[in-house]
């Protein structure tokens, strides 16, 4: 056969699926790759075929499109499986092709299994919600295009292996659940089981999300340094290991990138012709609220060393902030038979 | 095909307990939750409890909550309701019923329980 | 626990009549509402879950209404094999209860 694009294996496009529910898959091609969408394809003449590869096998079969029930069909650019069987697992790919063109991609699927808490192999998104924040709402995902307007769903909401029922703060909306005030408590996954009929057969689609209860806007301030502050000096004698940590706490912020770093006299260390280095550790709070560490490090300081300015540096989307260490060169000891009996005028 | 297929009738004497099984075929057992409904002789159906087999919980009407257990055996596939301290009113058709999404679209054949003294 | 009342407790009718039987909450149930038919016997049967929707293959004659605490199911031509025992159930908060069941018989 003629040349054709190849776009290879879209890994990036990592399908999961449950077993015995239905999903719809569009072809990648027109989302990630071609600079044209289903509709101006077919009006061009160009026709989107689909086959697979089963998983552990290499020999790419075509789609059979002529079960029972219809079990899978295409409809546009549209991979339906009403529902899915855990055999379906494997590599699927669409081309786009007529006489004089050819672009195809392939992409995999996995078929999963659940269990009756929900628990399976799947990815789970993430959703923040404010801690102490108001009333707030989570939206059952991906159901959209399983179902025309005029079906009227059941939706059942879950908090890990529990119905929400007579939750005091949690309530369920038909495709939405509303937290009326969310805590640390409400941490776990919640699962919303939609439940429609089409053509005279009845489908289920699940749906699990993770809600993360962060730090509220509210509440949030500009970063702060904890370390260096106006109680600790850095008193070193030259040849000694000087370590001054940069302690800095960032609020949680939607989005927002926090940033620390260090200043040696107004220079990135990497500008400063000395042996610095800086080790980062970073950990975090029950509502996600950040503390950053940088220990900047000079294994063996110098008397020039010790006379720079050292500042720490933090920024976040409430501000930026600085602070400078207070070094100094310790004075030796004083040696008594000199110094002190200097001290005390003797002759 | 999926399948729920429950014991055999049973005849005890009040104050006795019984225990009735519910064996599933045809699906991945701990995908699912099994509930327990009874029928008295002539009259509506009621609701006794359910079983999610993953994570072992059950909940119960509290009109039986100190006399049943409901659990589920994984390696078998098998749901069990066990009606202690029996009496006359407790006899009824038992049945189990799968469900998920809040469907019970599947049903035992059900088990006649005739407590007589 | 939610009470469902429902009516009549039985009816008679013939092949053709368009039957109606309701369902109501104590309390508000939402759309939470499942239809159960029963023949002698035997279990019971899924037609109507989430209040309007008919489960697999349950014959368009049967149709379910209704939301928060009335509901209502309609047999809209009766058929020979519908003579049994239909059962409202709320699946809405535990415990889960039915109505007591309504008995249509052949007139």
């Known amino acids: 056969s003629e040349r054709c694009d190849d776009w290879g294996l879209d890994t990036m496009r990592q399908i999961q699926v449950f077993e015995d529910e239905p999903a719809r898959i569009k072809c990648p091609l027109f989302e990630h790759f071609l600079k044209f969408n289903y509709s101006t394809a077919h009006s061009a003449g160009l026709t989107l075929i689909w086959y697979w590869t089963r998983q552990d096998r290499d020999l790419e079969e075509p789609i059979n499109f002529r079960l029972p029930e219809n079990r899978i069909s295409k409809e546009k650019d549209v991979l339906w499986f009403r529902p899915t069987l855990l055999n379906d697992t494997g590599n699927y790919t669409c081309m786009l092709r007529n006489t004089t063109y050819c672009s195809k991609v392939a992409f995999p699927l996995e078929v999963v299994q659940k269990d009756s808490c929900f628990n399976s192999p799947m990815k789970l998104p993430v959703h923040k919600l404010y801690i102490e924040y108001g009333i707030q709402r989570i939206t059952c995902p991906n159901v959209d295009g399983y179902f025309p307007s005029s079906v009227k769903p059941t939706i059942t909401w879950y908090m890990g292996c529990y119905k929400i029922q007579n939750f005091n703060n949690v309530i369920p909306e038909g495709m939405n659940l509303s937290f009326l005030i969310a805590f640390i408590s409400n941490n776990g996954n919640y699962t919303c089981v939609v439940t429609y009929p089409e053509n005279g057969r009845t489908f289920h689609l699940t749906r699990t999300l993770t809600v993360k209860v962060v730090g509220s806007p509210k509440n949030a301030v500009p970063p702060v340094i904890h370390s260096p502050n106006d109680h600790v000096v850095y008193e070193k004698e030259p040849g000694e290991e000087l370590l001054i940590p940069c302690t800095v706490y960032f609020s949680f912020l939607m989005d927002s990138r926090n940033e620390v770093w260090w200043t040696i006299d107004g220079k990135k260390p990497d500008d400063i012709p000395i042996d610095v280095t800086i080790n980062e550790s970073i950990s975090h709070s029950r509502t996600e609220d950040e503390t950053r560490t940088q220990i900047l490090s000079i294994k063996k300081v110098t008397s020039e060393d010790l006379k720079r300015s050292y500042v720490c540096h933090a920024r976040s989307a409430k501000g930026e902030v600085a602070k400078a260490a207070t070094v100094k060169q310790k004075v030796p000891a004083p040696r008594y038979t000199v110094e002190l009996a200097c001290g005390f005028g003797a002759t | 095909e999926v399948q729920l297929v429950q014991s055999g009738a049973e005849v005890k004497k009040p104050g006795s307990s019984v225990k009735v099984s519910c064996k599933a075929s045809?699906?991945?057992?701990?995908?699912?939750?099994i509930h327990w409904v009874r029928q008295a002789p002539g009259q509506g159906l009621e609701w006794m409890g359910y079983?999610?087999?993953?994570?072992?919980?059950?909940e119960y009407n509290q009109k039986f909550t100190d006399r049943v257990t409901i659990t589920a055996d994984k390696s078998t596939s098998t749901a069990y309701m066990e009606l202690s301290s029996l009496r006359s009113e407790d006899t009824a058709v038992y049945y189990c019923a799968r469900e998920y999404g809040d469907l019970f679209a599947y049903w035992g054949q059900g088990t006649l329980v005739t407590v007589s003294s | 626990a939610i009470q469902m009342t429902q009516s009549p407790s039985s009816l008679s009718a013939s092949v053709g009549d368009r039957v109606t039987i309701t369902c109501k909450a104590s309390?508000?149930?939402?759309?939470?509402v499942s239809w159960f038919q029963q023949k002698p016997g035997k279990s019971p049967k899924l037609l109507i879950y989430g209040a309007s929707n008919r489960y697999t293959g349950v014959p368009s004659r049967f149709s379910g209404s209704g939301s928060a605490t009335d509901f209502t199911l309609t047999i809209s031509s009766l058929q020979p094999e519908d003579f049994a025992t239909y059962h409202c159930g709320q699946i809405y908060i535990y415990p889960y209860t039915f109505g007591g069941g309504t008995k249509v018989e052949i007139k």
């Open positions: 045809g699906y991945t057992f701990n995908s699912y939750w």
């Open positions: 079983n999610n087999p993953t994570s072992g919980y059950s």
């Open positions: 309390e508000n149930v939402g759309y939470s």
